[in-house]
């Protein structure tokens, strides 16, 4: 495939990545799949500046990111190391709360109204953010 040099229509460029901000809600797995179908992934936050950039665009609205612990430890969807990476959890979070009555705990991370993160039930229909790196090779065949 060819290397992507500019962002697709309706995506926003920032620091060599492209971002797409949903205006509807989906469960985490559906949001994750949506991004994959766009040759992207749910947003992976690696710095204070990226956190602030995303916050600026989503406003005070619950929004999924590419972080989950559905298989045990917390993991970023693109393989970025969680333990050594940027974190911005709300106080007392993540708490894997079981008291919601929906079955199980809370395995998916989202931005809250103040931008800090919370873990929640993955089935909740929150907005989401897709991200793809500009330097990444596109899956589309090169134009002849």
């Amino acid at each position: 495939g060819s290397e992507r040099t500019c962002c697709p229509v309706n995506w926003v460029e920032h620091e060599r990545s492209c971002y797409w901000f949903s205006r509807s809600g989906k469960a985490w797995a559906d949001a994750d799949n949506y991004c994959r179908l766009e040759d992207a992934h749910l947003v992976v936050v690696t710095s204070w500046e990226e956190q602030k950039f995303v916050q600026h665009h989503i406003g005070p609205v619950n929004t999924w990111m590419g972080l989950h612990d559905q298989n045990g430890p917390w993991k970023w969807v693109d393989g970025t190391d969680y333990e050594t990476g940027f974190k911005n959890w709300r106080p007392e979070q993540p708490d894997d709360w079981y008291g919601h009555g929906l079955g199980g705990g809370e395995d998916c991370a989202h931005f809250t109204d103040d931008g800090r993160w919370n873990d929640d039930v993955c089935q909740r229909p929150y907005r989401w953010v897709c991200e793809t790196e500009l330097d990444k090779a596109s899956q589309e065949p090169p134009l002849l």
Partner: antibody, heavy 119, light 107 residues
């Protein structure tokens, strides 16, 4: 009401150390990031450091990196600034300030404590 | 690091005047721009956060505008208690940085 009270300032010789404290009350201290900001006599404001609500992350101004350490004790509702290898240019009034979590602005400030580095 | 500049560095005005102070960032800071007022011997006081949001308890004669790199603080009708120094600050990127300040004094 929100109250922040700094202490620990004074006169210290170059190369020596000093620890500032900031006692917080009137809000849930453990839920807020905190900042140190300083102001040299007759000069403008200079941001020094920030610490996450749980102490898990910290950032510093280049001018103090490697010499100053920001920390907190949430059980005591207290913020600290450990200042080592002090220089004359560190002479300033040091303010602690509470961070608004969404915008990171400093919404409440202490009255400040004066640190004078002089031989 | 992001550099913040302010203009003017000082201005002389009279009670009732409309006062405008500008702040410029060396790169895009979106709306992560705050304005503070400081009087001699006192701690700074937050006036405006997120470029245009008025802090609780601050008189409505203060307003902020702008996004990206260019921002403005406006005092619609200067009052005696408004003579002070005003600072802008960016909180988009660490290290956070302040502008050099604008001193507003009596004409």
């Amino acid at each position: 009401q929100v109250q922040l009270v700094e202490s620990g300032g004074g006169v210290v010789q170059p190369g020596r150390s000093l620890r500032l404290s900031c006692a917080a009350s009137g809000f849930t201290f453990s839920s807020y990031g905190m900042h140190w900001v300083r102001q040299a006599p007759g000069k403008g404001l200079e941001w020094v450091a920030v610490i996450w609500h749980d102490g898990s992350d910290k950032y510093y101004a280049d001018s103090v990196k490697g010499r100053f350490t920001i920390s907190r004790d949430n059980s005591k509702n207290t913020l600290y600034l450990q200042m080592n290898s002090l220089r004359a240019e560190d002479t300033a009034v040091y303010y602690c300030a509470r961070e608004d979590p969404r915008t990171s602005c400093s919404d409440y400030w202490g009255q400040g404590t004066l640190v004078t580095v002089s031989s | 690091d992001i550099q913040m500049t302010q203009s003017p560095s000082s201005l002389s005005a009279s009670v009732g005047d409309r006062v405008t102070i500008t702040c410029r960032a060396s790169q895009n800071i979106f709306s992560y721009l705050n304005w503070y007022q400081q009087k001699p011997g006192k701690a700074p006081k937050l006036l405006i956060f997120a470029a245009s949001s008025l802090q609780s308890g601050v008189p409505s004669r203060f307003s902020g505008s702008g996004s990206g790199t260019d921002f403005t603080l406006t005092i619609s009708s200067l009052q005696p208690e408004d003579f002070a120094t005003y600072y802008c600050q960016q909180t988009y990127s660490v290290p956070f940085t302040f502008g050099p300040g604008t001193k507003v004094d009596f004409k």
